[in-house]
Interface confidence: low
Amino acid sequence: IWELKKDVYVVELDWYPDAPGEMVVLTCDTPEEDGITWTLDQSSEVLGSGKTLTIQVKEFGDAGQYTCHKGGEVLSHSLLLLHKKEDGIWSTDILKDQKEPKNKTFLRCEAKNYSGRFTCWWLTTISTDLTFSVKSSRGSSDPQGVTCGAATLSAERVRGDNKEYEYSVECQEDSACPAAEESLPIEVMVDAVHKLKYENYTSSFFIRDIIKPDPPKNLQLKPLKNSRQVEVSWEYPDTWSTPHSYFSLTFCVQVQGKSKREKKDRVFTDKTSATVICRKNASISVRAQDRYYSSSWSEWASVPCS
Amino acid sequence: RAVPGGSSPAWTQCQQLSQKLCTLAWSAHPLVGHMDLREEGDEETTNDVPHIQCGDGCDPQGLRDNSQFCLQRIHQGLIFYEKLLGSDIFTGEPSLLPDSPVAQLHASLLGLSQLLQPEGHHWETQQIPSLSPSQPWQRLLLRFKILRSLQAFVAVAARVFAHGAATLSP
């Protein structure tokens, strides 16, 4: 058993039929010595008396809020949550496996630049009685600070018969050094509690590996005289790290016909303009990637040819 | 070339060669994004590589103030990786083809380090740890880790030279 936060405890249980469970001793937080009784949740049934209460925790029915009282007055509470271990593996019932980029990916994270700010998100089909707590650090043995904001519901989607909820959190490295080569990964830890079930999820990454720039901005076309060619120009996204002479992007320019089956023409360039042939009913798209490190491409910015 | 007394390197040449290094490092180990090498253990094997750290003056402001600190750090790293790529880890079994990207990478690391340091002038170089895994599969894993680490190193070096070429070239 360990303390998650004040008066909230997590009992780690091997979960199999007829498992013996875990013996837990609860102590009433009071100078009082006698006349103390214990109850569980909203029930008025007295579970025991005395300053300590010994219970055998085997299942969710044994978890909940234990309260000690004296003469009708509440003295203290202890909330017991269960963390299940099945076949040596901690349960992952609360969050959905996103399977990208690999199986058992519960947390996904992205950064728009090298400022040390990043966003992580996760999915669940649970809509109520759900809380998350997010902590992060750079490195684990001698951790350096990363401050995470609040995990908030960022999207709701219908997937077949199920509703899926996406939660996200923004974190910022306290003393980020955008120009340095990272040697220690960022660690993200998410505590999830659904009713009386506790689970934890972790992710470890370098900012450089989760970089995904925003799409190029101000995408414009300028027709060239007496030609089917156009000059496409664009700018670095506002959210990208500066100066751009240091934090450079490379770009992919694509001409795509109306039909998905039509051949795509692609040009790669480090410049912020390119000359392409604009076909009728086609569209021109541009996306960006870090010039020197192959992290994710941005989403496309598009403009019609006409 | 960076010469004693702190004159400027050939920023544009360094920029071109460092960008080529980035391309080669990724072609030598392109699937790196889909492999979480930290899960494989052997943390210590790549912990000894030189990293370009916050105080090394490789940020835009540090380069403007005095680029020599940063260039020295980059030079150390280039020599280190050049030695690693020429070591038993890469030359032993399973053997690489003579014209593999790793061979080109090795040559380019040497080329850039020579651009930064002409004959007769020596910055101190970091000792290369003795990494001689006995099993071929361990060697393979170690190659991946070294290339992964090299990709991050040359990305920072390329940013430095691109910025230098754009803002510090005479």
Epitope: K5, S127, T131, S133, T147, A150, A151, L153, V193 | -
Partner: antibody
Framework: QVQLVQSGAEVKKPGSSVKVSCKAS????????ISWVRQAPGQGLEWMGL????????YYAQKFQGRVTITADESTSTAYMELSSLRSEDTAVYYC????????????????????WGQGTLVTVSS | DIVLTQSPATLSLSPGERATLSCRAS???????LAWYQQKPGQAPRLLIY???RRATGVPARFSGSGSGTDFTLTISSLEPEDFATYYC?????????FGQGTKVEIK
């Protein structure tokens, strides 16, 4: 687009109670807290308390403890604020405001800003 | 309770001028818990800035927030006619959540 729509103006006698409603239209209640904030004529804003519509747990400012009751009906996406033992100084515009549900180094807590407000309900207490 | 003191109480400026509004807390407030609101007569408040420095959706770039600990600032770089209103800072660090008494920005 989500909107918070409040009930109409009320005139009440001192000592009586008033119950103001706040309905979320075009969205879900579940990911939000609903706070109640009041503003006396020509005065500043004063937070009264809030409710988590899913868990039903309400927090009240000490000043209003015992006089205010905040409730919510998730099925109709409506929150209610009832203020009892009214006095003339309770004359104010009462606003409901949404704050997204969040976590911060602890558990669910309404630490987010009030990003959506109702139009306000004027409650006049006069004999 | 955390007391937020805003200054000045009234700011008389002309369109195009820069407005600097101050909010001082009686005890330290994490910047993640500080917000600024704009209120016009007869209207509900509108969120401008949260996390001390982040602009809310649809808020023009002329509005910016800064500060940490006990001292926070809202800056309007160049006043537009529609910016003349009352501005409130708010902390959600501790319950009860509290607002400053407001700064009225009026046309000179």
């Amino acid at each position: 687009q989500v909107q918070l729509v409040q009930s109409g103006a009320e005139v009440k006698k001192p000592g009586s109670s008033v119950k103001v409603s706040c309905k979320a239209s075009g969205g879900t209640f579940s990911s939000n807290y609903i706070s109640w904030v009041r503003q006396a004529p020509g005065q500043g804003l004063e937070w009264m308390g809030l409710i988590d519509p899913v868990f039903g747990g309400a927090y009240y400012a000490q000043k209003f403890q015992g006089r205010v009751t905040i409730t919510a009906d998730e099925s109709t996406s409506t929150a209610y604020m009832e203020l009892s033992s009214l006095r003339s100084e309770d004359t104010a515009v009462y606003y409901c405001a949404r704050s997204k549900k969040g976590m911060y180094g602890g558990w669910t807590y309404p630490l987010m800003m009030f990003d959506l407000w109702g139009q306000g309900t004027l409650v006049t207490v006069s004999s | 309770d955390i007391v937020l003191t805003q200054s000045p109480a009234t700011l008389s400026l002309s369109p195009g001028e820069r407005a600097t509004l101050s909010c001082r807390a009686s005890q330290s407030v994490s910047s993640n818990y500080l917000a600024w609101y704009q209120q016009k007569p007869g209207q509900a408040p509108r969120l401008l800035i949260y996390y001390a420095s982040r602009r809310a959706t649809g808020v023009p770039a002329r509005f910016s927030g800064s500060g940490s600990g006990t001292d926070f600032t809202l800056t309007i770089s160049s006043l537009e006619p529609e910016d003349f209103a009352t501005y409130y800072c708010q902390q959600t660090s501790n319950t009860p959540f509290t607002f400053g008494q407001g700064t009225k920005v009026e046309i000179k």
